[in-house]
């Protein structure tokens, strides 16, 4: 069987939701010694990067300028060490935002609720769209989808304090072209043991995967990489 290197990791730097006309940055994290990285878009070659020097860095960044709907879609990457190619990375969905209009988001029964109450978000956009998306700040990968002609409902069911936080919604013209984001709506949920005092909202952190962790190799890392490569060959 044909030998392949382990698949790389593809990430969007800062966010996979890129405003139109802004630059998107995708990182492909492969291995030290990789001489070439290829970025594929919708299955076709999109860009090539050759790290310098290849043995000292474990990945590359691909800059996609002037984001638009034609550049939004599914990206993957591969890398090469010598003549040996890696498996293809997982697919990354790159979305263009700030297309056309801005929806409005509201929360029912209100922005302050108690644990156990049923909460519904409503996203409304009067221009032609049929898909709506709801995102929680710091959880941008957990996208909820709902459908409707000019508005969509996002029933959350009985909420807990884990639902605290800021939410935004988008109208979607296709899977990869989204509207401007709505103004954020902050949901405050008080727990059963609290009385009228409001608990603070949970801190929201940026999505941990929306960071490019490309590292330059130290002597120790080089030894470890060499040992790992030898061990893999022995296993084969």
């Amino acid at each position: 069987p044909k030998q392949t290197l382990p698949k790389p990791i593809i990430r969007a730097e800062s966010t996979y939701m890129v405003p139109k006309e802004k630059q998107a940055t995708l990182c492909c994290q492969g291995s030290y010694g990789a001489v070439e990285y290829q970025l594929h878009f919708e299955g076709s070659l999109f860009a090539v990067e050759r790290p310098k020097p290849p043995e000292r860095i474990n990945g590359v960044k691909f800059h996609i300028p002037d984001m638009n709907s034609r550049k939004a879609g599914r990206y993957s990457c591969i890398y090469r060490v010598g003549e040996l190619w890696s498996e293809r990375s997982d697919l990354l969905d790159l979305v263009v935002t700030e297309m056309y209009d801005t929806p409005t988001l509201s929360v029912h029964p209100g922005p302050e609720v108690t644990s156990g109450e049923k909460v519904t978000f409503y996203c409304r956009l009067d221009t032609a769209t049929s898909m709506f998306l709801l995102l929680k700040e710091g959880r941008s990968r957990d996208v909820q989808r709902s459908y409707g002609k000019v508005q969509a409902e996002f029933p959350m069911g009985p909420v807990t304090t884990a639902h605290r936080g800021s939410y935004r919604c988008f109208g979607s013209y296709n899977n990869y072209a989204w509207s401007f984001p709505s103004e954020p709506v902050k949901l405050l949920v008080t727990g059963d043991i609290e009385n009228t005092s409001l608990a603070p909202t949970d801190p929201t952190f940026p999505d941990s995967w929306d960071t490019c962790l490309l590292t330059r190799e130290t002597g120790l890392q080089k030894d470890l990489a060499l040992w790992d490569h030898t061990a893999q060959n022995l296993l084969r």
Epitope: P103, T104, L105, S106, H108, P109, G110, E112, V113, T114, G116, E117, K118, Y122, R124, Q151, P158, T196
Partner: antibody, heavy 117, light 107 residues
Framework: QVQLQQPGAELVKPGASVKLSCKAS?????SYWMHWVKLRPGQGFEW???????????NYNEKFKRKATLTVDKSSSTAYMQLSSLTSEDSAVYYC??????????WGQGTSVTVSA | DIVMTQSQKFMSTSVGDRVSVTCKAS??????VAWYQQKPGQSPKALIY???FRYSGVPDRFTGSGSGTDFTLTISNVQSEDLAEYFC?????????FGSGTKLEIK
């Protein structure tokens, strides 16, 4: 402080329509659902419906769907309820009320609607 | 629709007494029940939300309890200013519904 101002009374003829107003102040008008409630002497309170001013989404009590229409004017922070085809059954006090925290915690003074020829 | 039944239309009590106003829901409403007080010629005032949580500024002699279908508003050490009508409301499901009210009379 939060205030919901409603006119005191409206006298209307049977079959006519009336548009009740509720001017809000002291809070972010667009962020909270405005509810309308009907009170008839000896009948108790009936929830008519609610509207969120930010995007005009409404929820109605099925019983009032053909009777009441809720709207808002964001520029003046005013909510409206139009009642159509009025009969003596519609004679009541109508309250606008909002839920800022957990229940209907602020109420207008109510508008007394009298349907009479 | 969920029917909220307040079986006692009137309750008579004396200053300093303890009185319990009851409300029964026709189906389970969890703890999504509020209690309101309406004094003659005034608009309703919210006292309790989520069955047992008091609004700030509401005296601690007002307490709410219950869950599911049976709910109680208890006023301990009744004061003359508590002369009013009390009614419950469920906000668990549409349409929101109210009890018919219980008038508290002070002897």
């Amino acid at each position: 402080q939060v205030q919901l101002q409603q006119p005191g009374a409206e006298l209307v003829k049977p079959g006519a329509s009336v548009k009740l107003s509720c001017k809000a102040s002291g809070y972010t008008f667009t962020s909270y659902w405005m509810h309308w409630v009907k009170l008839r002497p000896g009948q108790g309170f009936e929830w008519i419906g609610e509207i969120i001013p930010s995007n005009g989404v409404t929820n109605y009590n099925e019983k009032f769907k053909r009777k009441a229409t809720l709207t808002v004017d964001k520029s003046s922070s005013t909510a409206y309820m139009q009642l159509s085809s009025l009969t003596s059954e519609d004679s009541a006090v109508y309250y606008c009320t909002i839920r800022l925290r957990y229940a209907l915690d602020y109420w207008g003074q109510g508008t007394s609607v009298t349907v009479s020829a | 629709d969920i029917v909220m039944t307040q079986s006692q239309k009137f309750m008579s009590t004396s200053v300093g007494d303890r009185v319990s106003v009851t409300c029964k829901a026709s189906q389970n409403v969890g703890t999504n029940v509020a209690w309101y007080q309406q004094k003659p010629g005034q608009s309703p005032k919210a006292l309790i939300y989520s069955t047992s949580f008091r609004y700030s500024g509401v005296p601690d002699r007002f307490t709410g309890s219950g869950s599911g279908t049976d709910f109680t508003l208890t006023i301990s050490n009744v004061q003359s200013e508590d002369l009013a009508e009390y009614f419950c409301q469920q906000y668990n499901s549409y349409p929101f519904t109210f009890g018919s009210g219980t008038k508290l009379e002070i002897k």
